[in-house]
Protein backbone atom coordinates (compact mmCIF):
# COMPACT_ATOMS: atom_id res chain seq x y z
CA UNK A 1 0.00 0.00 0.00
CA UNK A 2 1.23 3.48 -0.93
CA UNK A 3 -0.68 6.30 0.81
CA UNK A 4 -1.70 9.32 -1.25
CA UNK A 5 -0.20 12.75 -1.11
CA UNK A 6 -3.10 15.20 -0.82
CA UNK A 7 -2.91 18.82 -1.90
CA UNK A 8 -5.66 21.46 -1.80
CA UNK A 9 -5.48 24.52 -4.04
CA UNK A 10 -7.74 27.47 -4.76
CA UNK A 11 -8.27 29.56 -7.83
CA UNK A 12 -10.43 32.53 -8.72
CA UNK A 13 -13.78 31.71 -10.27
CA UNK A 14 -16.65 34.12 -10.92
CA UNK A 15 -16.92 37.25 -8.80
CA UNK A 16 -17.23 36.37 -5.12
CA UNK A 17 -16.50 32.70 -5.73
CA UNK A 18 -13.43 30.50 -5.76
CA UNK A 19 -12.84 27.00 -7.06
CA UNK A 20 -11.17 24.68 -4.58
CA UNK A 21 -9.48 21.55 -5.88
CA UNK A 22 -8.31 18.58 -3.83
CA UNK A 23 -5.74 16.37 -5.54
CA UNK A 24 -4.59 12.96 -4.40
CA UNK A 25 -1.51 11.52 -6.06
CA UNK A 26 1.01 8.70 -5.86
CA UNK A 27 -1.33 6.18 -4.19
CA UNK A 28 -1.84 2.45 -4.54
CA UNK A 29 -4.17 0.57 -4.75
CA UNK A 30 -6.48 2.68 -6.90
CA UNK A 31 -9.58 2.53 -4.65
CA UNK A 32 -9.95 5.88 -2.91
CA UNK A 33 -12.63 8.13 -1.46
CA UNK A 34 -12.03 11.80 -2.13
CA UNK A 35 -14.84 14.25 -1.43
CA UNK A 36 -15.63 17.69 -0.09
CA UNK A 37 -17.45 18.24 3.18
CA UNK A 38 -19.33 21.44 3.98
CA UNK A 39 -20.25 22.25 7.58
CA UNK A 40 -19.06 18.78 8.58
CA UNK A 41 -21.51 16.89 6.38
CA UNK A 42 -21.44 15.60 2.82
CA UNK A 43 -21.42 18.17 0.07
CA UNK A 44 -24.02 17.09 -2.48
CA UNK A 45 -22.58 15.19 -5.42
CA UNK A 46 -24.08 17.50 -8.02
CA UNK A 47 -21.95 20.39 -6.71
CA UNK A 48 -18.65 18.48 -7.02
CA UNK A 49 -16.63 17.53 -10.07
CA UNK A 50 -14.42 14.45 -9.98
CA UNK A 51 -11.50 13.52 -12.14
CA UNK A 52 -10.92 9.94 -13.22
CA UNK A 53 -8.53 7.81 -11.18
CA UNK A 54 -5.58 7.61 -13.57
CA UNK A 55 -2.17 5.95 -13.52
CA UNK A 56 0.56 8.51 -12.93
CA UNK A 57 3.32 6.50 -14.58
CA UNK A 58 5.01 5.19 -11.43
CA UNK A 59 2.72 2.25 -10.76
CA UNK A 60 0.58 4.52 -8.61
CA UNK A 61 -2.55 6.59 -9.25
CA UNK A 62 -3.87 10.13 -9.09
CA UNK A 63 -7.27 11.81 -9.00
CA UNK A 64 -8.97 15.06 -7.98
CA UNK A 65 -12.26 16.57 -6.82
CA UNK A 66 -13.26 20.22 -7.14
CA UNK A 67 -16.11 22.47 -6.09
CA UNK A 68 -17.00 26.15 -6.27
CA UNK A 69 -17.54 27.99 -3.00
CA UNK A 70 -18.17 31.54 -1.78
CA UNK A 71 -15.05 33.47 -0.93
CA UNK A 72 -14.98 34.00 2.83
CA UNK A 73 -16.60 30.63 3.61
CA UNK A 74 -13.40 28.62 3.19
CA UNK A 75 -13.28 27.51 6.84
CA UNK A 76 -16.53 25.61 6.39
CA UNK A 77 -15.06 23.27 3.75
CA UNK A 78 -12.67 20.35 4.10
CA UNK A 79 -11.48 17.71 1.67
CA UNK A 80 -11.89 14.20 3.05
CA UNK A 81 -9.67 11.35 1.86
CA UNK A 82 -9.97 7.68 2.72
CA UNK A 83 -7.55 5.08 1.35
CA UNK A 84 -6.76 1.55 2.50
CA UNK A 85 -8.31 2.07 5.93
CA UNK A 86 -6.57 5.39 6.57
CA UNK A 87 -8.18 8.79 6.34
CA UNK A 88 -7.32 12.46 6.55
CA UNK A 89 -9.01 15.83 6.19
CA UNK A 90 -7.52 18.83 4.44
CA UNK A 91 -8.60 22.46 4.84
CA UNK A 92 -8.72 25.10 2.15
CA UNK A 93 -5.54 27.22 2.27
CA UNK A 94 -5.96 30.86 3.26
Amino acid sequence: TVPPMVNVTRSEASEGNITVTCRASSFYPRNIILTWRQDGVSLSHDTQQWGDVLPDGNGTYQTWVATRICRGAEQRFTCYMEHSGNHSTHPVPS
Epitope: D39, G40, V41, S42, Q75, R76, T89
Partner: antibody, heavy 119, light 107 residues
Framework: DVQLQESGPGLVKPSQSLSLTCTVT?????????WNWIRQFPRNKLEWMGY???????NYNPSLKSRISITRDTSKNQFFLQLISVTTEDTATYYC????????????WGQGTLVTVSA | DIQMTQSPASLSASVGETVTITCRAS??????LAWYQQKQGKSPQLLVY???MLADGVPSRFSASGSGTQYSLKINSLQPEDFGSYYC?????????FGAGTKVEIK
Protein backbone atom coordinates in the same frame (compact mmCIF):
# COMPACT_ATOMS: atom_id res chain seq x y z
CA ASP B 1 -8.88 22.11 25.89
CA VAL B 2 -12.33 23.37 24.96
CA GLN B 3 -14.74 23.27 27.90
CA LEU B 4 -18.46 23.92 27.76
CA GLN B 5 -20.88 24.65 30.60
CA GLU B 6 -24.66 24.94 30.31
CA SER B 7 -26.73 27.12 32.63
CA GLY B 8 -30.31 28.26 32.93
CA PRO B 9 -33.54 27.70 34.81
CA GLY B 10 -34.41 24.13 35.67
CA LEU B 11 -38.16 24.67 35.58
CA VAL B 12 -40.22 26.34 32.85
CA LYS B 13 -44.00 26.65 32.60
CA PRO B 14 -45.86 25.37 29.53
CA SER B 15 -46.32 27.96 26.74
CA GLN B 16 -43.38 29.99 28.06
CA SER B 17 -39.88 30.26 26.60
CA LEU B 18 -36.89 28.16 27.57
CA SER B 19 -33.59 30.06 27.60
CA LEU B 20 -30.20 28.44 28.19
CA THR B 21 -26.61 29.66 28.06
CA CYS B 22 -23.48 27.77 27.06
CA THR B 23 -20.26 29.29 28.34
CA VAL B 24 -17.17 28.24 26.41
CA THR B 25 -13.67 28.37 27.85
CA UNK B 26 -10.38 27.47 26.24
CA UNK B 27 -11.39 28.51 22.72
CA UNK B 28 -12.96 31.53 21.04
CA UNK B 29 -16.34 30.77 19.50
CA UNK B 30 -15.50 33.21 16.69
CA UNK B 31 -12.33 31.36 15.69
CA UNK B 32 -13.83 28.21 14.18
CA UNK B 33 -16.27 25.34 14.65
CA UNK B 34 -20.02 24.89 14.84
CA TRP B 35 -21.47 25.40 18.32
CA ASN B 36 -24.42 23.09 18.91
CA TRP B 37 -27.34 22.34 21.17
CA ILE B 38 -28.41 18.73 21.65
CA ARG B 39 -31.07 17.46 24.03
CA GLN B 40 -31.78 14.10 25.62
CA PHE B 41 -35.33 13.21 26.56
CA PRO B 42 -36.22 11.33 29.76
CA ARG B 43 -36.29 8.01 27.88
CA ASN B 44 -32.75 8.77 26.61
CA LYS B 45 -33.50 9.65 22.98
CA LEU B 46 -30.98 12.22 21.69
CA GLU B 47 -32.01 15.05 19.37
CA TRP B 48 -29.72 17.48 17.56
CA MET B 49 -31.33 20.91 17.80
CA GLY B 50 -29.07 23.19 15.79
CA TYR B 51 -25.91 25.27 15.79
CA UNK B 52 -24.43 28.70 15.44
CA UNK B 53 -21.05 28.69 13.75
CA UNK B 54 -17.93 30.81 14.17
CA UNK B 55 -19.26 33.46 11.79
CA UNK B 56 -22.75 33.61 13.31
CA UNK B 57 -24.53 31.46 10.72
CA UNK B 58 -27.25 29.25 12.19
CA ASN B 59 -28.67 25.89 11.14
CA TYR B 60 -31.67 24.34 12.88
CA ASN B 61 -33.38 20.98 12.99
CA PRO B 62 -36.47 21.37 10.77
CA SER B 63 -38.57 19.72 13.48
CA LEU B 64 -37.89 22.78 15.68
CA LYS B 65 -37.44 25.50 13.10
CA SER B 66 -40.51 27.55 14.01
CA ARG B 67 -39.64 27.57 17.75
CA ILE B 68 -35.85 27.69 18.04
CA SER B 69 -33.31 30.48 18.04
CA ILE B 70 -29.58 30.17 18.71
CA THR B 71 -27.65 33.37 19.28
CA ARG B 72 -24.33 34.36 20.82
CA ASP B 73 -22.47 37.00 22.80
CA THR B 74 -18.94 37.03 21.45
CA SER B 75 -17.69 39.37 24.19
CA LYS B 76 -18.58 36.76 26.81
CA ASN B 77 -17.74 33.76 24.62
CA GLN B 78 -21.24 32.41 25.15
CA PHE B 79 -23.97 31.07 22.92
CA PHE B 80 -27.62 30.73 23.76
CA LEU B 81 -30.65 28.58 23.11
CA GLN B 82 -34.16 29.95 23.08
CA LEU B 83 -37.14 27.64 22.56
CA ILE B 84 -40.56 29.27 22.53
CA SER B 85 -44.01 27.85 23.29
CA VAL B 86 -42.66 24.92 25.27
CA THR B 87 -44.75 21.93 26.29
CA THR B 88 -44.11 19.05 28.65
CA GLU B 89 -42.60 17.26 25.63
CA ASP B 90 -39.64 19.65 25.84
CA THR B 91 -38.62 18.28 29.24
CA ALA B 92 -35.07 17.04 28.66
CA THR B 93 -31.42 17.36 29.57
CA TYR B 94 -29.92 20.01 27.31
CA TYR B 95 -26.29 19.75 26.23
CA CYS B 96 -24.07 22.14 24.37
CA UNK B 97 -21.30 20.76 22.21
CA UNK B 98 -19.25 21.65 19.17
CA UNK B 99 -17.85 20.05 16.09
CA UNK B 100 -14.99 20.82 13.77
CA UNK B 101 -15.50 21.05 10.03
CA UNK B 102 -13.66 17.83 9.28
CA UNK B 103 -16.87 16.04 10.30
CA UNK B 104 -20.05 16.69 12.27
CA UNK B 105 -19.35 14.46 15.24
CA UNK B 106 -19.18 15.79 18.79
CA UNK B 107 -15.80 15.37 20.51
CA UNK B 108 -16.76 17.09 23.79
CA TRP B 109 -20.04 17.90 25.48
CA GLY B 110 -21.02 20.06 28.42
CA GLN B 111 -22.24 18.30 31.54
CA GLY B 112 -25.88 18.99 30.63
CA THR B 113 -28.67 20.81 32.39
CA LEU B 114 -32.07 19.31 33.13
CA VAL B 115 -35.04 21.45 32.16
CA THR B 116 -38.47 20.37 33.35
CA VAL B 117 -41.55 21.85 31.72
CA SER B 118 -44.38 21.76 34.22
CA ALA B 119 -47.19 23.95 35.47
CA ASP C 1 -34.38 12.74 7.32
CA ILE C 2 -32.15 9.72 7.79
CA GLN C 3 -33.37 7.47 10.60
CA MET C 4 -30.92 5.42 12.66
CA THR C 5 -32.10 2.08 14.04
CA GLN C 6 -29.99 0.47 16.75
CA SER C 7 -30.13 -3.11 17.95
CA PRO C 8 -30.42 -4.60 20.41
CA ALA C 9 -32.13 -2.05 22.64
CA SER C 10 -30.39 -3.66 25.61
CA LEU C 11 -28.15 -6.60 26.37
CA SER C 12 -26.72 -8.33 29.41
CA ALA C 13 -23.13 -9.53 29.31
CA SER C 14 -20.40 -10.62 31.66
CA VAL C 15 -16.96 -9.13 32.10
CA GLY C 16 -14.65 -10.71 29.52
CA GLU C 17 -17.36 -11.35 26.94
CA THR C 18 -17.44 -9.88 23.44
CA VAL C 19 -20.48 -7.81 22.49
CA THR C 20 -21.59 -6.33 19.19
CA ILE C 21 -24.03 -3.46 18.70
CA THR C 22 -25.46 -2.67 15.29
CA CYS C 23 -26.82 0.48 13.72
CA ARG C 24 -28.82 0.62 10.51
CA ALA C 25 -29.38 3.85 8.58
CA SER C 26 -32.50 4.42 6.48
CA UNK C 27 -30.26 5.50 3.60
CA UNK C 28 -26.64 5.18 2.53
CA UNK C 29 -24.55 7.35 4.86
CA UNK C 30 -21.21 6.49 3.24
CA UNK C 31 -19.32 5.95 6.55
CA UNK C 32 -20.45 9.30 7.97
CA LEU C 33 -21.07 7.68 11.35
CA ALA C 34 -20.01 8.24 14.97
CA TRP C 35 -20.46 6.15 18.11
CA TYR C 36 -20.77 7.47 21.68
CA GLN C 37 -20.71 5.90 25.13
CA GLN C 38 -22.77 7.36 27.97
CA LYS C 39 -22.57 6.40 31.61
CA GLN C 40 -25.51 7.00 33.94
CA GLY C 41 -25.80 10.69 34.81
CA LYS C 42 -22.90 11.70 32.55
CA SER C 43 -22.55 13.31 29.13
CA PRO C 44 -22.00 11.17 26.02
CA GLN C 45 -18.35 10.58 25.11
CA LEU C 46 -17.09 10.12 21.57
CA LEU C 47 -15.78 6.63 20.83
CA VAL C 48 -15.62 6.38 17.03
CA TYR C 49 -15.87 8.75 14.06
CA UNK C 50 -15.81 8.22 10.30
CA UNK C 51 -17.37 4.78 11.02
CA UNK C 52 -14.08 3.09 11.95
CA MET C 53 -11.71 5.56 13.56
CA LEU C 54 -11.22 5.35 17.33
CA ALA C 55 -11.24 8.69 19.13
CA ASP C 56 -8.23 9.67 21.21
CA GLY C 57 -7.87 7.63 24.37
CA VAL C 58 -10.38 4.92 23.40
CA PRO C 59 -9.07 1.45 24.32
CA SER C 60 -8.18 -0.92 21.48
CA ARG C 61 -10.75 -3.47 22.68
CA PHE C 62 -13.27 -1.26 20.89
CA SER C 63 -13.53 -1.65 17.13
CA ALA C 64 -16.03 -0.49 14.56
CA SER C 65 -16.90 -1.46 11.02
CA GLY C 66 -19.55 -1.12 8.36
CA SER C 67 -20.47 0.58 5.14
CA GLY C 68 -23.54 1.77 3.26
CA THR C 69 -26.45 1.45 5.68
CA GLN C 70 -25.09 -1.15 8.13
CA TYR C 71 -22.58 -0.40 10.90
CA SER C 72 -21.42 -2.15 14.04
CA LEU C 73 -19.48 -1.48 17.23
CA LYS C 74 -17.66 -4.39 18.83
CA ILE C 75 -16.26 -4.56 22.35
CA ASN C 76 -13.80 -7.37 22.93
CA SER C 77 -13.28 -8.61 26.48
CA LEU C 78 -15.86 -6.38 28.10
CA GLN C 79 -14.53 -4.47 31.12
CA PRO C 80 -16.50 -3.13 34.13
CA GLU C 81 -16.07 0.43 32.87
CA ASP C 82 -17.70 -0.46 29.53
CA PHE C 83 -21.17 -0.84 31.00
CA GLY C 84 -23.52 1.96 30.00
CA SER C 85 -25.42 3.09 26.93
CA TYR C 86 -24.10 3.36 23.37
CA TYR C 87 -25.45 5.59 20.63
CA CYS C 88 -24.74 5.92 16.92
CA UNK C 89 -25.06 9.21 15.04
CA UNK C 90 -24.90 9.92 11.32
CA UNK C 91 -23.48 13.10 9.82
CA UNK C 92 -24.20 12.50 6.15
CA UNK C 93 -26.72 15.34 5.98
CA UNK C 94 -28.83 17.63 8.13
CA UNK C 95 -30.59 17.06 10.41
CA UNK C 96 -28.03 15.03 12.30
CA UNK C 97 -29.80 12.11 13.96
CA PHE C 98 -28.95 9.54 16.62
CA GLY C 99 -29.92 5.95 17.22
CA ALA C 100 -32.19 5.19 20.17
CA GLY C 101 -29.31 3.62 22.09
CA THR C 102 -28.21 0.22 23.36
CA LYS C 103 -27.93 -0.31 27.09
CA VAL C 104 -25.14 -2.73 28.07
CA GLU C 105 -25.79 -4.18 31.51
CA ILE C 106 -23.90 -6.53 33.79
CA LYS C 107 -25.17 -10.11 33.74
Amino acid sequence: DVQLQESGPGLVKPSQSLSLTCTVTGYSITSDYAWNWIRQFPRNKLEWMGYINYSGTTNYNPSLKSRISITRDTSKNQFFLQLISVTTEDTATYYCSYYRYDGAWFPYWGQGTLVTVSA
Amino acid sequence: DIQMTQSPASLSASVGETVTITCRASGNIHNYLAWYQQKQGKSPQLLVYNAIMLADGVPSRFSASGSGTQYSLKINSLQPEDFGSYYCQHFWSFPLTFGAGTKVEIK
